[in-house]
């Protein structure tokens, strides 16, 4: 079975939360849910509320954790300027990190005189309703789960290209005489809570995770 990514590309470290009492709410809700034989979790999908049964232990499996997936009762903190942030992702479960910031810098942290070949932008996406799973099938993503009257929203930390052509001839710093170049968004798969019929289930879904430069030779170079 494929593994969800455990790290985020260098320069796009996801800032760790300030630990607040919010972090305990999901733990508490799960503890209570565990005491019941079958926990009823109301999942709101595309504006509808359905009662579905979820095994709370699903949230405790370490292999499911990805720093790019967050369950939170409130939106991750938005940071106007994240160039100064240099936090590392801690070992806590994704649903414990409730205050990670939105990253919207044009490229990762560089020393003076260094540039990115492609510019990327990273944001927390909290309104994902559908996604493509690892088998290429479109699946319904759970936007919110209601556990013991606490509504937890599912957020995804996505990174994509700001522009396919950071300079008008393609990627930055490429010899445009001999090379074609353009920036493109690449993807990875993360475990997310999705709807499987009437049940909530963890599935690998595809999300945008990086911006890379694609090169191909000019014919004049080949000739």
């Amino acid at each position: 079975e494929p593994h969800s990514e455990s790290n985020v590309p260098a320069g796009h470290t996801i800032p760790q939360a300030h630990w607040t009492k919010l972090q305990h709410s999901l733990d508490t809700a799960l503890r209570r849910a565990r005491s019941a034989p079958a926990a009823a979790i109301a999942a709101r999908v595309a504006g509808q509320t359905r009662n579905i049964t979820v095994d709370p232990r699903l949230f405790k499996k370490r292999r499911l954790r990805s720093p790019r997936v967050l369950f939170s009762t409130q939106p991750p903190r938005e940071a106007a300027d994240t160039q100064d942030l240099d936090f590392e992702v801690g070992g806590a479960a994704p649903f414990n990190r409730t205050h990670r910031s939105k990253r919207s810098s044009s490229h990762p942290i560089f020393h003076r005189g260094e540039f990115s070949v492609c510019d990327s932008v990273s944001v927390w996406v909290g309104d994902k309703t559908t996604a493509t799973d690892i088998k290429g099938k479109e699946v319904m993503v759970l936007g919110e789960v209601n556990i013991n009257n606490s509504v937890f929203k599912q957020y995804f930390f996505e990174t994509k290209c700001r522009d396919p052509n950071p300079v008008d001839s393609g990627c930055r710093g490429i010899d445009s005489k001999h090379w074609n170049s353009y920036c493109t968004t690449t993807h990875t798969f993360v475990k997310a809570l999705t709807m499987d019929g009437k049940q909530a289930a963890w599935r690998f879904i595809r999300i945008d995770t990086a911006c890379v430069c694609v090169l191909s030779r000019k014919a004049v170079r080949r000739a």
């Epitope: 008008d168 001839s169 445009s176 005489k177 170049s181 191909s216 000019k218 014919a219 004049v220 000739a223």
Partner: antibody
Framework: QVQLVQSGAEVKKPGASVKVSCKAS????????MQWIRQAPGQGLEWIGA????????RYSQRVKGRATLTADQSTSTVYMELSSLRSEDTAVYYC????????????WGQGTLVTVSS | DIQMTQSPSSLSASVGDRVTITCRPS??????LNWYQQKPGKTVKLLIY???RLYSGVPSRFSGSGSGTDYTLTISSLQPEDFATYFC?????????FGQGTKVEIK
């Protein structure tokens, strides 16, 4: 937005020369190969040659090598195609086209310049 | 030089029809195959680059496929504005070469 504007139609006698211009705007002129292509009446497209305005480097097809000269003027963002020793079979619409970033495709084309060679 | 054999040279079709044009290079061009649309009095337009990638602003009814020495342009549902001449072009090596064109006419 990117635009390529070519000079007007020309009528020339066999043996003469013609110089067609292609003025570019809306992008970094020096960083893209400019291609020249022609189309004889009722025929397909034929590649003539290319120039890289950044350093003036050129490539020509064997069919016109020695008769075609491509030049670029960075100050006016204009490329020129001069064809000498004209023959009747050079009668065609001449196009300039920018080679883009993708698979050596031509993403913007000029409107074309009709060159008629007739005695 | 790489020869590009395009077929058919012309075809008659109605609005809503599915249209397929093929292009066969004389040697493997590694997917460096582009398709253009030409209309009288208009500038030539790039439709598809690198065999199957839709150029910006081109309607999704246009699609391309193929590999090696066999490539296809498909218009899934012909629209009135699609009546034009279509050319294939190999961007693999110099000299660049083109197909002879396919004129799509109204039936």
């Amino acid at each position: 937005q990117v635009q390529l504007v070519q000079s007007g139609a020309e009528v020339k006698k066999p043996g003469a020369s013609v110089k067609v211009s292609c003025k570019a705007s809306g992008y970094t002129f020096s960083r893209y190969w400019m291609q020249w292509i022609r189309q004889a009446p009722g025929q397909g497209l034929e590649w003539i040659g290319a120039i890289y305005p950044g350093d003036g480097d050129t490539r020509y097809s064997q069919r016109v090598k020695g008769r075609a000269t491509l030049t670029a003027d960075q100050s006016t963002s204009t490329v020129y195609m001069e064809l000498s020793s004209l023959r009747s079979e050079d009668t065609a619409v001449y196009y300039c086209a920018r080679e883009g970033n993708f698979a050596n495709s031509f993403d913007y084309w000029g409107q074309g310049t009709l060159v008629t060679v007739s005695s | 030089d790489i020869q590009m054999t395009q077929s058919p040279s012309s075809l008659s079709a109605s609005v809503g029809d599915r249209v397929t044009i093929t292009c066969r290079p004389s040697q493997d061009i590694g997917n460096h195959l582009n398709w253009y649309q030409q209309k009288p009095g208009k500038t030539v337009k790039l439709l598809i680059y690198f065999t199957s990638r839709l150029y910006s602003g081109v309607p999704s009814r246009f699609s391309g496929s193929g590999s090696g020495t066999d490539y296809t342009l498909t218009i899934s549902s012909l629209q009135p504005e699609d009546f034009a001449t279509y050319f294939c072009h190999q961007g693999y090596t110099l000299p660049y070469t083109f197909g002879q064109g396919t004129k799509v006419e109204i039936k």
